[in-house]
């Protein structure tokens, strides 16, 4: 009686059950009732990461440094090359085929977490004692300056974009 | 590169035995099956047998079974046919040849066998 | 046992006209298990088709298969000196036997 289901790592063909390549490896031949599946290979730029009963092997990822892409880790027969960005750059998607520019955190707004090959810079609003007066990609939310610990008081309230600014306490003669 | 190179052949009485060797190369012998098919001169192809990969499976044209044994021995990369009691009809050029499930792909240059008295 | 009914047995033709041989088989070939050689005298055969239509490694494309079920056949589109020869049918979808047709001979008109 011919089967209808096969087990793991087999596949069934013409009501017979036969092997799957393993990875790294591409289907030549299905298997008979007297030899097995046929696999090859694949070649140096190509892979396949799973059993398979594929007959072509997917060509490597380029990492195309016109588009800011560098190697991150090399692919294998089994595995595919992992691109990442050029520093000051990250992925635009999670397959990284493109990479843009890191923003920049706007004046009242810090860094919360720098920007990775492939993360763009998250940005928080400065809370209150805080401020940022620059456009950055780096800089946190700085405190605003403690006039008290210089024996000086506030003259101008700081903002999320300013500091303080502090001047001498008024003196009585 | 791949090859079959088949050897044992010649000329033998009738009800006498001879055995053909069969000798692979470039590629991996243990993964496939093995054919024996013969030619009678100036005739067709006739298939006669065949082996699995490990041995395990043969079958036989009715022709000779019961006569001729198809055998292997991966170790030495050899398929063998064992031909018992011949007749003037098993007088052929006899090739073996490669299984795949796309025919029989890579064949031997063949060893001719003469059954006469 | 698949019978398989090669015609015409004879083939005569001039380089570079259309060869067209057929091969019936006597029940279904299941799966289209049907295949093509070429063989030249004091030669062993070569696999031209497998699959009915499927071309083998290193062949030339001139040489095409089709049919399926019982009715089979093996074109050659613009023949070559080189293509004078006798052609089998195999099935390998039924057996044992795995049977050969009786073959046909194209030579040269």
């Known amino acids: 009686e011919p089967p209808t289901a096969c087990r793991e790592k087999q596949y069934l063909i013409n009501s017979q059950c036969c092997s799957l390549c393993q990875p790294g490896q591409k289907l030549v031949s299905d298997c008979t009732e007297f030899t097995e599946t046929e696999c090859l290979p694949c070649s140096e730029s190509e892979f396949l990461d799973t059993w398979n009963r594929e007959t072509r092997c997917h060509q490597h990822k380029y990492c195309d440094p016109n588009l800011g892409l560098q190697v991150q880790q090399k692919g294998t027969s089994e595995t595919d090359t992992i691109c990442t960005c050029e520093e000051g750059l990250h992925c635009t998607s999670e397959s990284c085929e493109s990479c843009v520019p890191h923003r920049s955190c706007l004046p009242g707004f810090g860094v919360k977490q720098i920007a990775t090959g492939v993360s763009d810079t998250i940005c928080e609003p400065c809370p209150v004692g805080f401020f940022s007066n620059v456009s950055s990609a780096f800089e946190k939310c700085r405190p605003w300056t403690s006039c008290e610990t210089k024996d000086l008081v506030v003259q101008q309230a700081g903002t999320n974009k300013t500091d303080v600014v502090c001047g001498p306490q008024d003196r009585q003669r | 590169q791949v090859q079959l190179v088949e050897s044992g052949g010649g000329v033998v009485q009738p009800g006498r035995s001879l055995r053909l060797s069969c000798a692979a190369s470039?590629?991996?012998?243990?993964?496939?099956?093995m054919h024996w098919v013969r030619q009678a001169p100036g005739k067709g192809l006739e298939w006669v047998a065949v082996?699995?990969?490990?041995?395990?499976?043969?079958y036989y044209a009715d022709s000779v079974k019961g006569r001729f044994t198809i055998s292997r021995d991966n170790s030495k990369n050899t398929l063998y046919l064992q031909m018992n009691s011949l007749r003037a009809e098993d007088t052929a050029v006899y090739y073996c040849?490669?299984?795949?499930?796309?025919?029989?792909?890579?064949w031997g240059q063949g060893t001719m066998v003469t059954v006469s008295s | 046992e698949i019978v398989l009914t090669q015609s015409p047995g004879t083939l005569s033709l001039s380089p570079g006209e259309r060869a067209t041989l057929s091969c019936r088989a006597s029940?279904?070939?299941?799966?289209?298990?049907l295949a093509w050689y070429q063989q030249k005298p004091g030669q062993a055969p070569r696999l031209l088709i497998y699959?009915?239509?499927s071309l083998a490694t290193g062949i030339p494309d001139r040489f095409s298969g089709s049919g399926s079920g019982t009715d089979f056949t093996l074109t050659i589109s613009r023949l070559e000196p080189e293509d004078f020869a006798v052609y089998y049918c195999?099935?390998?979808?039924?057996?044992?036997?795995?049977?050969f047709g009786g073959g046909t001979k194209v030579e040269i008109k």
């Open positions: 040849a490669r299984d795949t499930s796309r025919g029989h792909d890579i």
């Open positions: 470039g590629f991996t012998f243990e993964k496939y099956g």
């Open positions: 082996i699995s990969y490990e041995g395990t499976k043969k």
């Open positions: 029940q279904s070939v299941s799966y289209s298990y």
């Open positions: 699959g009915a239509s």
């Open positions: 195999q099935q390998y979808s039924d057996y044992p036997p795995f049977t």
